[in-house]
């Protein structure tokens, strides 16, 4: 069956250092235990974290990704994942597109990660 | 089966204080962002609070803004709001409800507990 | 802050008679709408999300449809136990917002 995926419509922000979680789920609801689900950065398509048969395939991982990454499948039986980043770097920010592939049907949506730098102040003048 | 369970509302003088719980059960809480909701006596629903799964990330209605603070213990599956400086027009039944990440409705609600402001 | 604006206010209709309730959005909220349904002393309970789809556990005679600013909440025939409160809400900006709920009752 068909169906559409959802993330967030606005910029998720971030600390430098911090974790960060960015949900994305399809749309209608239906399990997806099954599907190939994942995440990856435009413009080259680099894997932040892919899940396929059942298990997490952390050896596609891009290197700057791995051991920094965790899926959250509490809510995959109603098609409702979360991808968690530690150790937030300026390097994160920009784009990401989360997918779910199943069989040959696959859908994405892209969201945006804004880091920031915990120490940043303006001095007075 | 998921459940809400608000408590902690009651009838306090303009200016007062309340703590307002929602015990979770039947799900993973902590994958859940979490919303404080109120419905002031024969009037619409209007959106209160919300706090992300972790806690780490909180969101106010202009109108609660600075007198109201959203937070959650993932230990004891509870989401509270502390509703500080109370005006008579915050008097409400105040529903707690979750959504997915903040990019879902909200697919369950508690049963509300009344807050009344009266001198 | 997005302002969700429903119509009519009120609506008298009789039970086996279709409902055509609506919902406009002061900006575009793309797909992110939902319905609810909340009969007195009750908390709401979720119809539809994402504008068109139906909530676990509620009849097909329920249908949403619309995005960006326009949608519209249908009844295909009415049962007793459909008339309640109806809001819509949008969960695609915070503040999320819901409109100020459109009453169903007998004719």
């Known amino acids: 069956g068909q169906f559409r995926v959802i993330g967030p419509r606005h910029p998720i922000r971030a600390l430098v250092g911090d974790e960060v979680e960015l949900p994305c789920r399809i749309s209608p609801g239906k399990n997806a235990t099954g599907m190939e689900v994942g995440w990856y950065r435009p413009p080259f398509s680099r894997v932040v974290h892919l899940y396929r048969n059942g298990k997490d395939q952390d050896g596609d991982q891009a290197p700057e990704y791995r051991g920094r990454t965790e899926l959250l499948k509490d809510a995959i039986g109603e098609g409702k994942v979360t991808l968690r980043i530690r150790n937030v770097r300026f390097s994160d920010e920009g784009g990401f597109t989360c997918f779910f592939r199943d069989h040959s049907y696959q859908e994405e949506a892209a969201m945006e990660l804004k880091v920031e730098d915990p120490f940043y102040w303006v001095s007075p003048g | 089966q998921v459940q809400l369970v608000e408590s902690g509302g009651g009838l306090v003088q303009p200016g007062g204080s309340l703590r307002l719980s929602c015990a979770a059960s039947?799900?993973?809480?902590?994958?859940?962002?979490m919303n404080w909701v109120r419905q002031a006596p024969g009037k619409g629903l209007e959106w209160v609070s919300a706090?992300?799964?972790?806690?780490?990330?909180?969101y106010y209605a202009d109108s609660v803004k600075g007198r109201f603070t959203i937070s959650r213990d993932n230990s004891k599956n509870t989401l509270y709001l502390q509703v500080n400086s109370l005006r008579a027009e915050d008097t409400a039944v105040y529903y707690c409800a979750r959504d997915y990440g903040g990019i879902s409705p909200f697919d369950y609600w508690g049963q509300g507990t009344l807050v009344t402001v009266s001198s | 802050e997005i302002v969700m604006t429903q119509s009519p206010a009120t609506l008298s209709l009789s039970p086996g008679e279709r409902a055509t309730l609506s919902c406009r959005a002061s900006q575009s909220v793309s797909s992110y709408l939902a319905w609810y349904q909340q009969k007195p002393g009750q908390a709401p309970r979720l119809l539809i999300y994402?504008?068109?789809n139906r909530a676990t556990g509620i009849p097909a005679r329920f249908s949403g449809s619309g995005s960006g600013t326009d949608f519209t909440l249908t009844i295909s025939r009415l049962e007793p136990e459909d008339f309640a409160v109806y809001y819509c809400?949008?969960?695609?900006?915070?503040?999320?917002?819901f409109g100020q709920g459109t009453r169903l009752e007998i004719k």
């Open positions: 809400q949008q969960y695609g900006s915070s503040p999320y917002t």
């Open positions: 706090i992300s799964g972790s806690g780490g990330s909180t």
């Open positions: 039947g799900f993973t809480f902590s994958s859940y962002a």
């Open positions: 994402d504008a068109s």
